[in-house]
Interface confidence: low
């Protein structure tokens, strides 16, 4: 009506969408008696009565508040429960006497979008697009009002930008009242966004202030033609015989090219094509000298047909060759000399070492080894290590054993051995010598021979306890070509229940073990005992 | 929209030929490597034949090896499958699928064309 | 080269299924894995290491050790009854070869 004063503007409430709205009846005394008030609301111009205050009790009219409604504050707020966003919209108080007065409050519905998920294009981009591709999807689902989408790649935000970048954004009414938002990002993308990390974020505001919410970091598969390609050898640094060595074929393209690998013949100096699985890994497993030489790559554009060759690599695999020995079979006799030359050939320097076998002794670090007054006990085993030092664990041996000419030599020479009547015992025998001696024992029983080294072997005779055998005794003989030699093992008897625990005899290299004559398959380690005091 | 239309497939006497084609379009048809994929009545999915996606290299099945050709022309969008000296056990739907060497075998497939080989 | 497949397995509704798919090749590539119904063209459904196609619930998943693979339906719908293939490309040549799976027969009870 001109000349009335203009309508103030409407108090904001602000609340989230669930919430409970307090909207309060702002007209003062003079205005209107709260105790006589109609609540309006306004939705495109039209007021509908939404509640009646009289005599400060609240009645709900029929109709979409009915049931949300109560008054508070002694009959001065209005609350609304269970704020939807078809909440947003003016409400009015209007006092009644002395004269009819309103005051109008604009209320606000908010809430904040779930988590933004994004989904990045699974079938990637190619660089040389003409325009703008599919790169990822960001959708932000029900939020109030509609939230703002930012896109950031590399943790910078993206713009618009006429045939290079473009957000498509899209929202859509859920049947709560809520949005979702849909926000696709289309980009020309170049081989250096392989990596580039992107991602959405959400702007939206609440009573609280204004928030945001960032989607996970995705990576967009980039597809760019190869412009090189390259060979890799693993492991880097140098390579010995026996390695796992893998040639890896390696492109700056995606997808990689198909890949072949090609070894130059070192006769024909033709390149000859090696076996590689469609990786381009060629795996060399045991590595050997034969796989040194000029190897180069070749990748092949399936689309294209383009073919790229990669610079040679030369690949030198280390090796020592087999170990020789001279003499390879020594023999000498006891008081002679003898001179042992070792021979290698090796990709790099050789060091020499001699080592005696028994011990693991080092007598001589160089090729040759010199043994003078030889005496029985220098004969057995000598090793020869040929090595290359500044490549560990490239190193090849060779064993040469030395024959030094003599009668059988015992273990032991005397050894007793307690036992218990119908026993069987377990007994053994040891003798050295070369030639090398063979065993024989003094009673019947079940023997067994073994040999040990070229010079030494080992009898195991398994024999029943009879009284005759603990008058006798036993005797293992060792012979060869030049002489005999015996042991004499005496047998005492001795009652089980007085062994001692954990006490295996160890005399010698010879071992017995008793057992019941009537249970075979059940033995028992012989113990050693404390010798009676009667004994000199 | 991705598409793959086969056509092509009728009944044929052993020992004759047939062409199969399939038409593309919704994408950049010469960036994709193509194949052809069958499966006889009743039976698994047996990958018959690959071409690159210029139509220079070429692979197939041991099954069909010197008896089918595959090729394309880009300008059309259309890939092609000749087939000679057909055996009764080359009877099968036969589908074309596009294919991305390296990354992403077979993620479009068309609706597929019957094959039946039959005196 | 072969891979192999059980024939068929069955799922009770909402339960977890694991077909699974055994060949040399499944050492140096992952397998694809498709979906057909009947009458129907195959859907890809898995690819990679374990990547889904817009459009694929993620109740399909994959996993690959050795010289198996696998695709797991975790809550398993009636919809997903369907025979189901693997597929690999060949590792032993230089020429591009695929195969695919013998194939199982899914029945969602």
């Known amino acids: 009506v001109p000349g009335e004063a203009e309508q103030p503007a409407p108090e904001l409430v602000e609340v989230e969408v669930g919430s409970t709205a307090l909207l309060k009846c702002g007209l003062s005394q003079s205005q209107g008696n709260l105790s006589h008030v109609d609540w309006f609301s306004v939705h495109k111009e039209k007021r509908t009565l939404i509640f009646r205050v009289r005599q400060g009790q609240g009645q709900s009219e029929p109709g979409e508040y009915e049931q949300r409604l109560s008054l508070q504050d002694r009959g001065a707020t209005l609350a609304l429960t269970q704020v939807t966003p078809q909440d947003e919209r003016i409400f009015l108080c209007q006092g009644k006497r002395p004269r009819s007065q309103e005051y109008r409050i604009q209320l606000r519905v908010y809430k904040a979008p779930e988590e933004p998920n994004i989904q990045v294009n699974p079938l990637g981009i190619p660089v040389n697009s003409k325009e703008p591709e599919e790169v990822a999807t960001c959708v932000g689902r029900n939020g109030y009002p509609i939230p703002q989408v930012i896109w950031y790649k590399n943790g910078r935000p993206l713009k618009e930008e006429k045939n290079r970048v473009h957000i498509q954004s899209s929202q859509t009414v859920e049947s709560s009242g809520l949005y979702t938002l849909q926000s696709i990002l289309k980009a020309q993308l170049v081989k250096e966004d392989k990596d580039a990390q992107f991602y959405c974020e959400l702007n939206y505001r609440l009573p609280s202030g204004n928030h945001m919410k960032e989607s996970r970091e995705v990576t967009v598969p980039v597809f760019y033609p190869t412009e090189k390609v390259w060979l890799e050898v693993e492991p880097v640094g140098m390579l010995k015989e026996g390695d796992r060595v893998e040639i890896r074929c390696l492109a700056d393209g995606n997808p990689p090219p198909h890949f072949s690998i090609s070894k130059q013949n070192p006769s024909t100096r033709e390149a000859e094509e090696e076996t590689t699985n469609d990786n381009g890994v060629l795996v060399l497993e045991p590595a050997r000298k034969e796989h040194s030489g000029r190897y180069e790559c070749q990748g092949l554009d399936l689309d294209t047909m383009i073919s790229l060759l990669s610079e040679p690599q030369e690949l030198l695999v280390n090796y020592v060759s087999d170990v020789r020995v001279s003499p390879a079979a020594p023999e000498r006799q006891e008081g002679s000399s003898l001179t042992l030359t070792c021979e290698a050939e090796s990709s790099q320097d050789l060091e020499f070492q001699w080592l005696r076998e028994e011990t693991g002794q080092v007598l001589e670090r160089g090729p040759v080894l010199q043994l003078h007054d030889l005496k029985r006990e220098a004969g057995g085993g000598y090793r020869c290590v040929a090595s290359v030092p500044s490549i560990p664990g490239l190193n090849r041996t060779q064993l040469v054993n030395v024959a030094i000419f003599g009668p059988p030599w015992m273990a032991f020479k005397e050894r007793k051995v307690w036992v218990k009547e119908n026993m069987v015992l377990n007994l053994s025998c040891e003798a050295s010598g070369h030639p090398r001696p063979t065993i024989s024992w003094n009673v019947n029983g079940t023997a067994s021979e073994q040999d040990q080294d070229p010079q030494r072997v080992l009898s195991t005779l398994n024999v029943l306890v009879t009284p005759e055998l603990l008058e006798t005794g036993v005797e293992c003989t060792a012979s060869n070509d030049l002489g005999k030699n015996t042991s004499i093992l005496f047998l005492e008897l001795v009652n089980l229940t007085t062994l001692t625990p954990d006490s295996n005899t160890t005399t010698g290299l010879s071992t017995s073990t008793a057992s019941p004559h009537t249970r075979a398959n059940s033995t028992s380690t012989e113990r050693k005992l404390p010798e009676p005091e009667s004994r000199g | 929209e991705v598409q793959l239309v086969e056509s092509g497939g009728s009944l044929v006497q052993p020992g004759g030929s047939l062409r199969l084609s399939c038409e593309a379009s919704?994408?950049?048809?010469?960036?994709?490597?193509m194949s052809w994929v069958r499966q006889a009545p009743g039976k698994g999915l047996e990958w018959v034949s690959i071409?690159?996606?210029?139509?220079?290299?070429?692979s197939y099945a041991d099954s069909v090896k010197g008896r089918f050709t595959i090729s394309r022309d880009s300008s059309k969008n259309m890939l092609y499958l000749q087939m000679n000296s057909l055996r009764a056990e080359d009877t099968a739907v036969y589908y074309c699928?596009?294919?991305?060497?390296?990354?992403?075998?077979?993620?479009?497939w068309g609706q597929g064309t019957l094959v039946t080989v039959s005196s | 080269f072969m891979l192999t497949q059980d024939p068929a397995v069955s799922v009770a509704l909402g339960q977890t299924v694991r077909i699974t798919c055994q060949g040399d090749s499944l050492r140096s590539y992952y397998a694809s894995w498709y979906q057909q119904k009947p009458g129907q063209s195959p859907v890809l459904v898995i690819y990679g290491k374990n990547n889904r196609p817009s459009g694929i619930p993620d109740r399909f998943s994959g996993s690959s050790s050795g010289n198996t693979a696998s695709l797991t339906i975790t809550g398993a719908q009636a919809e997903d009854e369907a025979d189901y293939y693997c597929?690999?490309?060949?590792?032993?040549?230089?020429?591009?070869?695929?195969?695919f799976g013998t194939g199982t027969k899914l029945t969602v009870l």
């Open positions: 071409i690159s996606g210029s139509g220079g290299s070429t």
């Open positions: 597929n690999s490309r060949d590792s032993s040549g230089n020429h591009p070869l695929y195969v």
């Open positions: 919704g994408f950049t048809f010469s960036s994709y490597a």
């Open positions: 699928a596009r294919d991305k060497y390296g990354y992403n075998p077979f993620d479009y």
